[in-house]
Interface confidence: low
């Protein structure tokens, strides 16, 4: 229904709480380089606003978009030209050309310097003072870092860190208690950020159809009992969410969230029989359960997928009726009989089904022409499922650092021309993955593994469109999201590349390295290796594992020793000759 | 190149009022934000009032319902209308135009409020 006015009417929905956090995510996301105080005083200033046209519709400005009040507000900020550079010029446009502006000029690698926590002490000080302005902070910080990050689920991870605070700054050992909790809140949160930029990736690249495709193979895996109808209604819904939150519109999303969440806990006996503890939740918590809820029993009596999509005599009657349909079924078929594959993997049979009916259909005899079809999608399922065990074996056979450091001399050898900090953070990240799912049971494993390196690679994709140095990562970039884990996994050694110069400083270390927390030793060592790849991007796993267990040794011997600076500037010299050696 | 001057500052007791103007010439097209800045000594400067390119306005909380905005397109002219005026008000009031070539200050005009 229309409301006179859109703000006041958000304001009640979500409540001054809420609607104050994703205001200031919202900012936080379009402007990345704006201060907390800055974006604080415009946040109280529109929810002052708000106030106002929740007393009286009717009063100033009131009717106004969303979009063209929070504009407004970001268009007048002091210094916009010197702090933002062309992003000033989206403000020569009126809305919606504006917002779009906007989107276009998030940045999903913002120079800022990486969010340190501080230590525990003066954390719970400073909660303890003030808790709101502490939280706002948080939101702030992580919302400029990750500009399409999934906000109502930003203010989950809010909540849990206020409930983390709250508990161990009571405690004796603040530490001790605030680490491992928080370490994992910002793992799963880093997660959710890349998964979900992936599903804004899809939409501005290829639409909702793209997006619901995605959300029917999902729903359908969760939830298969449901009927199609049910997942249709689901799917549709979730892809609105989805799309008010990748296009900025974050209050409607938020607020969609919520009555999606109410409405699949008001009709559990048609979704899933598995929602009830998820429900019994308050807001926040009952939609994130909702979101990585498990899996619903499979009906014991489920027909085999031939009878309805190949031995039917009407296949391609039932086609050319309605195709969006037709295939849809197919998927929410094959998917809720699936819960084994990941949804990439769904999609990809669902492509390669689509393409055989345009093939067969337009035949003299359809029926022996897609008889084959199922028997067609062998070759698509092995491909990931071996990708899984040998990716696995490896991780279990050399532990999170070491499969790390395979996947970046992979990578590197693939992509030479990209950054090494581009490739040692996705190295770094696609090597978690062992971790994250090899250690589940193994019907759970490909879909963890395909659908989370997916995410992986889609950040790999975004950083390199915005400076292009591989016609490689190009190639495997441009083409369906769907496809671009296969393509680089099948990528090999890039035979164009001219292999780089060595130069001794890159190899180069000082006895400040001992200091460093063992992540950022890992990272300096990682670099290393990455560069001695693109040295010689020929060498022999054996060779690069000779350099660097040389590397470590020298490291180990020289942050032991009595003078640190002295081992570092003797022996350096003596580990870089070594290293050319070897590789020589 | 874009020059702005601001006019009608001055000193003025509690509770009087004050008419700025800011006048802009130079190539000046385009035009999508006009506004008001302020800066009181060891302070930082803040959006006093603004007025965008289809009308809306926009007030800080301190001014709302004592200061008024408005253009002259034509002219190429932002007024700020200043009522019921507070010793808080004291500063040196700016004005700001933005448009496709860049953001554009002048000089700034002193308004002193005191008794």
């Known amino acids: 229904e229309a409301h006179k006015s859109e703000i006041a009417h958000r304001y009640n929905d979500l409540g001054e709480q809420h609607f104050k956090g994703l205001v200031l995510i919202a900012f936080s996301q379009y402007l990345q380089k704006c201060s907390y105080d800055e974006h604080a005083k415009l946040v109280q200033e529109v929810t002052d606003f708000a106030k106002t046209c929740v007393a009286d519709e009717s009063a100033a400005n009131c009717d106004k978009s969303l979009h063209t009040l929070f504009g407004d507000k970001l268009c007048a900020i002091p210094n916009l030209r010197e702090n933002y550079g062309e992003l000033a010029d989206c403000c020569t446009k009126q809305e919606p050309e504006r917002n779009e502006c906007f989107l276009q000029h998030k940045d999903d690698n913002p120079s800022l310097p990486p969010f340190e926590r501080p230590e525990a002490e003066a954390m719970c000080t400073s909660f303890k003072e003030n808790p709101t302005t502490f939280m706002g902070h948080y939101l702030h910080e992580v919302a400029r870092r990750h500009p399409y990050f999934y906000a109502p689920e930003l203010l989950y991870y809010a909540e849990q860190y206020n409930e983390i605070l709250t508990q161990c700054c009571a405690e004796a050992d603040k530490e001790s208690c605030l680490t491992p909790k928080l370490d994992g809140v910002k793992e799963k949160a880093l997660v959710s950020s890349v998964r979900q930029r992936m599903k804004c990736s899809s939409m501005q690249k290829f639409g909702e159809r793209a997006f619901k495709a995605w959300a029917v193979a999902r729903l359908s895996q969760t939830f298969p009992n449901a009927d199609f109808a049910e997942i249709t209604k689901l799917a549709t819904d979730l892809t609105k969410v989805n799309k008010e939150c990748c296009h900025g519109d974050l209050l409607e999303c938020a607020d969609d969230r919520a009555e999606l969440a109410k409405y699949m806990c008001e009709n559990q006996a048609t979704i899933s029989s598995k929602l009830q503890t998820c429900c019994d939740k308050p807001l926040l918590k009952k939609a994130h359960c909702l979101s990585e809820v498990e899996h619903d029993t499979m009906p014991a009596d489920l027909p085999a997928i031939a009878a309805d999509f190949v031995e039917d005599q009407e296949v391609c009657k039932n086609y050319a009726e309605a195709k969006d349909v037709f295939l849809g079924t197919f998927l929410y078929e094959y998917s809720r009989r699936h819960p084994d594959y990941s949804v990439s993997l769904l999609l990809r049979l669902a492509k390669k089904y689509e393409a055989t009916l345009e093939k067969c259909c337009a035949e003299a005899n359809p029926p022996a022409c897609y008889g084959t079809v199922l028997a067609e999608f062998q070759p698509l399922v092995e491909e990931p499922k071996n990708l899984v065990k040998t990716n696995c074996d490896l991780y279990e056979k050399l532990g999170e650092y070491g499969f790390q450091n395979a996947i970046l001399v992979r990578y590197t050898q693939k992509a030479p021309q990209v950054s090494t900090p581009t490739l040692v953070e996705a190295a770094r990240n696609l090597g978690r993955v062992g971790t994250k799912c090899c250690t589940l049971p193994e019907d759970q494993r490909l879909p963890c593994v395909e659908d989370y390196l997916s995410a992986i690679l889609n950040r790999v994709c975004l950083l390199h469109e915005k400076t292009p140095v591989s016609e490689h990562v190009t190639k495997c970039c441009s083409g369906s999201l769907v496809e671009r884990r296969p393509c680089f996994s099948a990528l090999t050694v890039d035979e164009t590349y001219v292999p780089k110069e060595f130069k001794a400083e890159t190899f180069t270390f000082h006895s400040d390295i001992c200091t460093l927390p063992e992540k950022e030793k890992q990272i300096k060592k990682q670099t290393a290796l990455a560069e001695l790849v693109k040295h010689k991007p020929k060498a022999t796993a054996e060779q690069l594992k000779t350099v660097m267990d040389d590397f470590a040794q020298f490291l180990d011997t020289c942050c032991k020793a009595a003078d640190k600076d002295t081992c570092f500037s003797t022996e350096g010299p003596n580990l870089v000759t070594r290293c050319k050696d070897a590789l020589a | 190149q874009v020059q702005l001057v601001e006019s009608g500052g001055g000193l003025v007791q509690p509770g009087g009022s004050l008419r700025l103007s800011c006048s802009a010439s130079?190539?000046?097209?385009?035009?999508?934000?006009m506004g008001w800045y302020r800066q009181a000594p060891g302070k930082q400067r803040e959006l006093v009032a603004s007025?965008?390119?289809?009308?809306?306005?926009h007030y800080a909380d301190t001014v709302k319902g004592r200061f008024t905005i408005s253009r002259d397109n034509s002219k190429n002219m932002v007024y700020l209308q200043m009522n019921s005026l507070e010793p808080e008000d004291t500063a040196v009031y700016y004005c700001?135009?933005?448009?496709?070539?860049?953001?554009?200050w002048g000089q700034g005009t002193q308004v002193t409020v005191s008794s």
């Open positions: 700001d135009i933005r448009n496709v070539g860049g953001d554009y």
């Open positions: 130079g190539s000046i097209w385009g035009i999508y934000h």
């Open positions: 007025i965008t390119v289809d009308g809306s306005t």
